[in-house]
Amino acid sequence: VPRWRQQWSGPGTTKRFPETVLARCVKYTEIHPEMRHVDCQSVWDAFKGAFISKHPCNITEEDYQPLMKLGTQTVPCNKILLWSRIKDLAHQFTQVQRDMFTLEDTLLGYLADDLTWCGEFNTSKINYQSCPDWRKDCSNNPVSVFWKTVSRRFAEAACDVVHVMLNGSRSKIFDKNSTFGSVEVHNLQPEKVQTLEAWVIHGGREDSRDLCQDPTIKELESIISKRNIQFSCKNIYRPDKFLQCVKNPEDSSCTSEI
């Protein structure tokens, strides 16, 4: 008789999840010599230990502490790029501007990027059929708690000028319910962070509006100012040109507004 299995609303664990995490860990430590001390087998064991045999709606930040400890990494605190709803461009940017880092450029962010995982209470099985959806099922699921934990730590580590890339094509350019709006904004440390600089990325080629005047950006400014952090905002009218100018800053066309 097949055992009854909880059906969740979200997609199941990414196929070959253990192998993917382990492969990413090995690749990351090969490419980043400063992380050579990391034992990827131990990292996987700690990752697995955070959610295996636990109810997937009952995961806590505490469950991830052994993994956080193994993945401890020092990134230059003044070179942090946060993003919201515009991951691809943020990653393209840090691939070119190698001295800046998104969360996914760190070991733990790199391991979990675009993956889904969950287990089942009281069994050592990984659930490849379905996992809890943040809205429809529960917020304390393995994936959401992981990103909340690593995002909080990443924001806490930031100093000086912190940059955030925001998607100007969305109805809410700043969304209080995003990871940036609900976690990272509130964990920037005013005693370390001087300024949050928002880069609002325009979608349409003919869009010449000043999106820094958007009501949601004003809301972000208000939240940040109340936390005794300065706020500045820039429109990036031509993201393609922006990337090109990061690659070739001496290009004559890069002196004009992008």
Epitope: E19, A23, V26, E30, I31, P33, Q41
Partner: antibody, heavy 121, light 107 residues
Framework: QVQLVQSGAEVKKPGSSVKVSCKAS????????INWVRQAPGQGLEWMGR????????NYAQKFQGRVTITADESTSTAYMELSSLRSEDTAVYYC??????????????WGQGTLVTVSS | EIVMTQSPATLSVSPGERATLSCRAS??????LAWYQQKPGQAPRLLIY???TRATGIPARFSGSGSGTEFTLTISSLQSEDFAVYYC?????????FGQGTKVEIK
């Protein structure tokens, strides 16, 4: 004792492909990175890439990206290196090599005997 | 990619003498450096890893030193079986790269 046994010498025409095999014996194959290193006649050594069989994870040196494919067959403990669009400069001895430690692949303690690939019209 | 430069290209030494081989990296590779020995018609053989740790079964006359960009392989008293080509390899940054080799020949 770990042994890596490679396939025999090959003569290929420019523009064609070659596939060299490397069969491992002696201990558990799947957890260990198998690397491919080549050596042109009278020249130094050049790292091409590697695969970790059970992770099915291959990585290549930029120079060979798009032209080399490294695969592994866990059932036969054999790794393969396929190089396409061959040119005369690809004439070399191709070695497979492995490290002592599982997963990691920094330096190589075990080497195959080498496979001479000659590219000539 | 990191360029590894070995010197001299050829070293002529008498048996029993000391041989000092040099390897320079175009940028720091920390201690992530290995040395290999290769004889004609044979595959390379690992001698040293971590810049100074001898691999299993390697005689004590082989020693490695250095870190950052400057490395040395020393063979304290050359035996007849030591005449070969020696390569350094960095494994700090992808792709792993080798030096062009130093040939140690009988004087």
């Amino acid at each position: 004792q770990v042994q890596l046994v490679q396939s025999g010498a090959e003569v290929k025409k420019p523009g064609s492909s070659v596939k060299v095999s490397c069969k491992a014996s002696g201990d558990y194959f799947n957890n260990y990175a198998i690397n491919w290193v080549r050596q042109a006649p009278g020249q130094g050594l050049e790292w091409m890439g590697r695969i970790i069989p059970f992770l099915d994870d291959a990585n290549y040196a930029q120079k060979f990206q798009g032209r080399v494919t490294i695969t592994a067959d866990e059932s036969t403990s054999t790794a393969y290196m396929e190089l396409s669009s061959l040119r005369s400069e690809d004439t070399a001895v191709y070695y497979c090599a492995r490290a002592t430690s599982p997963l990691y692949s920094y330096y190589f303690d075990y080497w195959g005997q080498g496979t001479l690939v000659t590219v000539s019209s | 990619e990191i360029v590894m430069t070995q010197s001299p290209a050829t070293l002529s030494v008498s048996p029993g003498e000391r041989a000092t081989l040099s390897c320079r990296a175009s940028q720091s590779v920390s201690s992530n450096l290995a040395w290999y020995q290769q004889k004609p018609g044979q595959a390379p053989r690992l001698l040293i890893y971590g810049a100074s740790t001898r691999a299993t079964g390697i005689p004590a006359r082989f020693s490695g030193s250095g870190s950052g960009t400057e490395f040395t392989l020393t063979i304290s008293s050359l035996q007849s079986e030591d005449f070969a080509v020696y390569y350094c390899q960095q494994y700090n940054n992808w792709p792993w790269t080798f030096g062009q080799g130093t040939k140690v020949e009988i004087k």
